[in-house]
Interface confidence: medium
């Protein structure tokens, strides 16, 4: 069975699949659509790397443009560093800034709903 | 308004390469990933690969793996396609074309096309 | 690779009569599916995106439906500039792929 055929099989049962599942698929060429990509836990897409949901979406990766302002695309953007984002070709923005340093204080994340940033 | 333009047509002898261009203008250049697709005489459309304009990175179909090569000038928001070891059942159209442009996904805008014709 | 299947090959329609031509996916899609007309000497034109949505300018006659594997592309009402061929699309998954075309034509 192929990444895609697999993806079927369990496409019903991944919105709520934590993190590592997530990462999982990302090495099994998958290509998951952007309707089940938005269906997906907002604290399950957060950690993803650029790199992990392009490998992830395959071909749907460019559609990431289009749902830049929804969750939890909008919120995976405000986690990522804008020279990662770059590197899609996109045109995303919103990601940390070039020279910021990202703190991973969750507290602080979960009163704002955005990560504290330490400038350059 | 969208716009691509590609080089005009090419007559090559079995063995040589041909190379391709694409000038995009009417919208950002980097934030769309560009796709080759070519149609020989009477078959289907049949796609070659794509580039992320942002950061040079592709993707190619297998079957021209080894004699593809697609890049850019982000400078000139012009792509390439390269194709090498030619053939004669190489003689076809060869479309660039962007996708997803506008949030929607297909093929929504594509060049002229270009004839390569390969013959000895 | 996904095979994309069309049929027929060639269709002759009365003018005014509906038009339906095909398209079977050799495995699930989902709704990544894109249909286009192309005719004689020009590039492809888009006319419908993720199975039933038309791109902007395109005639209401034309319509798509279908998930899965199976999908349809139906001309309501044909008129004399409908006369193309027409291709299918998956791009669920890479490579992309092609139907192999309907060709269709006034009786």
């Known amino acids: 069975m192929n990444g895609s055929e697999y993806f079927v099989k369990i496409q019903s049962f991944l919105g709520g699949a934590p993190t590592e599942d997530l990462k999982a698929l990302s090495q099994q060429n998958v290509s998951m659509d952007l309707a089940t990509f938005m269906k997906l836990r907002t604290d399950a897409v957060l950690p993803l790397t650029v790199a992990e949901v392009q490998k992830l979406l395959g071909p749907h990766v460019e559609g990431l443009k289009a749902e830049e302002r929804h969750r939890p695309v909008r919120d995976w953007i405000l986690r990522q560093r804008q020279d990662d984002l770059d590197t899609l070709g996109l045109g995303l923005q919103g990601g940390i800034p070039n020279g910021y340093l990202v703190l991973d204080l969750s507290m602080q994340e979960a009163l704002s709903g955005t990560p504290c940033l330490l400038g350059p | 308004e969208v716009q691509l333009v590609q080089s005009g047509a090419e007559v090559k002898k079995p063995g040589a390469s041909v190379k391709v261009s694409c000038k995009a203008s009417g919208y950002t250049f980097t934030s769309y990933w560009m796709h080759w697709v070519r149609q020989a005489p009477g078959q289907r459309l049949e796609w070659m690969g794509n580039?992320?304009?942002?950061?040079?990175?592709?993707n190619y179909n297998e079957k021209f793996k080894n004699r593809v090569t697609i890049t850019v000038d982000k400078s000139a928001s012009t792509a390439y396609m390269e194709l090498s070891s030619l053939r004669s059942e190489d003689t076809a159209v060869y479309y660039c074309a962007p996708h997803y442009i506008g949030s929607r996904p297909g093929f929504a805008y594509w060049g002229q096309g270009t004839l390569v014709t390969v013959s000895s | 690779d996904i095979v994309m299947t069309q049929s027929p090959d060639s269709l002759a329609v009365s003018l005014g009569e509906r038009a339906t031509i095909n398209c079977k996916a050799s495995?699930?899609?989902?709704?990544?599916i894109a249909w286009y007309q192309q005719k004689p000497g020009q590039s492809p034109k888009a006319l419908i995106y993720?199975?039933?949505y038309r791109y902007s300018g395109v005639p209401d006659r034309f319509s798509g439906s279908g998930s899965g594997t199976d999908f349809t592309l139906t001309i309501s009402s044909l008129q004399a500039e409908d006369v193309a061929v027409y291709y299918c699309?998956?791009?669920?998954?890479?490579?992309?792929?092609f139907g192999g075309g309907t060709k269709v034509e006034i009786k």
């Open positions: 699309q998956q791009y669920n998954s890479y490579p992309l792929t």
């Open positions: 495995q699930n899609v989902g709704t990544n």
């Open positions: 580039v992320n304009p942002s950061n040079g990175g592709s």
């Open positions: 993720s199975a039933s």
